[in-house]
Structures are given as C-alpha cells and as structure tokens.
Amino acid sequence: KGMHAAQPAVVLASSRGVASFVCEYGSSGNAAEVRVTMLRQAGSQMTEVCAATYTVEDELAFLDDSTCTGTSSGNKVNLTIQGLRAMGTGLYICKVELMYPPPYYVGMGNGTQIYVIDPEPCPDSD
C-alpha cells in the first residue's frame, strides 16, 4: 500500500561533509516497527546508503554507523549523513516502510538534493 513521505528539496552539507534532513511520513498508524532506507540516485542508478529498522515506541537513536545516524520521533525521522565529499553530491531519497504489524505500507520521498563543496585546502604558510 502507498504512503506519502516528505523531505526537503535541497540541503547544503557542512564544511565537514555532514548533511542532515527530516523525513516525515503520513502517519505510523498502528505500526510498531518502521524501516527507513536512505537511497542515493545518480543518473539511473539507485544505491542504498544506509538502512535501519526502529521501533516506534522507542523514539530513540535507531541508526548509528559510519555513514548515517538517525533518530525518530513519531512519524518524523531525522537523518544525518557523514563523510560526504564533492563527489557525494546527488539526490538522496528517503524510503519508509511500515513493517509490522500488517498492513504493510511503503512511501518514498521525492528526494533531497545534497550539495557538497569540498573545503579549499589551507595555503602553505612560510
């Protein structure tokens, strides 16, 4: 079954290569377990950046790996991607699945364009 997911259109990564945005989905309804997947679209290629399942009742950090961190609160998920470089610029799509209990719902946002600008190297000092 279909479900709406919303995310910002554009986000600028920090000079340290960190970008954060909120992915909000229609409603968790009776869902106890929700799976959130971050996808990166480059041309016709779609690759999974990170994914995790969290329990709605927790409202805690649910994702903590080298690439992504995530916290949840109700039907909002705050996603942070780390270690971005200029070549990481692209469209990042938030996919939300209401996994359990049934019925299964899935929603995909329209994507957030993340712009990454590599910092200028410091000039040599004499």
Epitope: N30, A32, E33, E57, Y100
Partner: antibody, heavy 116, light 112 residues
Framework: EVQLVESGGDLVKPGGSLRLSCVAS????????MNWVRQAPGKGLQWVAW????????TYADDFKGRFTISRDNAKNTLYLQMNSLRAEDTAVYYC?????????WGQGTTLTVSS | DIVMTQTPLSLSVSPGEPASISCRSS???????????LEWFQQKPGQSPQRLIY???NRFSGVPDRFSGSGSGTDFTLRISRVEADDAGVYYC?????????FGGGTKLEIK
C-alpha cells in the same frame, strides 16, 4: 497510566446477541492495534480478532468470521466486539488487549455466559 | 492457520530447580521483515495474562532474568533457571507473525 476496561458481559440465551466494550485511557488510542482474546472456563487463551485502530481494518480468527464483528470508535477511545448467533461454547472471559512490541496491556476481562 | 503445540501439558517442579517448556509451530513463524514474533505469557489464577518474553528471547521489562526464551523457525523454548513459588501458573506461547495470530494450548506449572 494506561487502562483497558471491558464491560458488557452478561447471561445470554443461545442464538442471542451481545456487544462487548473496552474503554482505553492513558495513551493515544489510534497508535496501537487492539485485540480481543477469550478464555473458556478452565481452558486456554484463544485469539479472536484484531483491529488496526488507525485504519479500522479488522482481522479475525477463522472460528469467528461471520458471527463476530470487531470495531472501534476513536472519538470515544473504545473498542467493541459484536457477537451474534451465540452458542454455549462461546461462554468465556473476554479480554481486550493492546498490541505492542514493548508495552502490551490487557484488561481485566468481562464474562459472557451463554445458557438457556 | 498456524497451530502452536506446547509440551508438556503440565509439570511439577521443586523450588530452586529448573523448568523448561517447549512450543512448536506447524510452520515457520519468521515474518517477512526477518523478525520472529514469538511471545510467552504467564497467567496466574483469576488474573489477566502477563507477557514475559517478546520476539523469542527478549525479556519484558520487570521480568526476572530467571526467565529466558530461545529458539528459531518452528521450535521455541521457555526456560526458568531456578523456579520460585511465585512462578506457579499457566504459561502460553503466542505467535504474532502470521494472521490469524494463535496461542499455544498452555502448560501448567505446579510448584512441589
């Protein structure tokens, strides 16, 4: 504090009908699915039905399809079980129970007796 | 429908001794997301059931660590490492993976 309070249990003649109620309090009713579970005297637990309180979508155990109807009134935070064509073997304590991974709650039960 | 078969029907255990209850499902109860929603309940006379274990092996808050759950696929076990007088009651397994959800028939634990 979460509370589930069942009511409506009674003595009913075979073939009769009855509606049980379960009033929920202390939490957002539409965030959790709700079950009816019954227990005949001296017997085990039997899952009857479940409703997604957000969508209203019901699911039944095969034994109860057609005779029993689970429903809810979100404005009243109340779960219902409408029982028709009652039989002696429907005599039981009926529990409402909140479906949850971490925080399940059960009511104290209400007793239905079907006898002539 | 998935049938949950519990054994034994009853057991009598002395305080301090271990107890083990088996629950077998008629087919796999692994849900489509990879989780297994197998739960254990305890019911004391005249009371509503109380959940002890969820998702096979996770103890519900406040449940003593004497209680443990294990298993996978179709075979599951509830163990009590050292039985206490307060543990007397009927124990039920429950599968919430595949609708219609179903309970096992129950195992009565009596303390000698």
């Amino acid at each position: 504090e979460v509370q589930l309070v069942e009511s409506g249990g009674d003595l009913v003649k075979p073939g009769g009908s009855l509606r049980l109620s379960c009033v929920a309090s202390g939490y957002t009713f539409t965030n959790y699915g709700m079950n009816w579970v019954r227990q005949a005297p001296g017997k085990g637990l039997q899952w009857v039905a479940w409703i997604n309180t957000y969508t209203g979508e019901p699911t039944y155990a095969d034994d109860f399809k057609g005779r029993f109807t689970i429903s809810r009134d979100n404005a009243k935070n109340t779960l219902y079980l409408q029982m028709n064509s009652l039989r002696a073997e429907d005599t039981a304590v009926y529990y409402c129970a909140r479906r949850s991974i971490y925080y399940p709650y059960w009511g104290q039960g209400t007793t239905l007796t079907v006898s002539s | 429908d998935i049938v949950m078969t519990q054994t034994p029907l009853s057991l009598s255990v002395s305080p301090g001794e271990p107890a083990s209850i088996s629950c077998r499902s008629s087919q796999s109860i692994v849900y489509s997301n990879g989780n297994t929603y197998l739960e254990w309940f305890q019911q004391k006379p005249g009371q509503s059931p109380q959940r002890l274990i969820y998702k096979v092996s996770n103890r519900f808050s406040g449940v003593p660590d004497r209680f443990s759950g294990s298993g996978s696929g179709t075979d599951f076990t509830l163990r009590i490492s050292r039985v206490e007088a307060d543990d007397a009651g009927v124990y039920y397994c429950f599968q919430g993976s595949h609708v219609p959800w179903t309970f096992g028939g129950g195992t009565k634990l009596e303390i000698k």
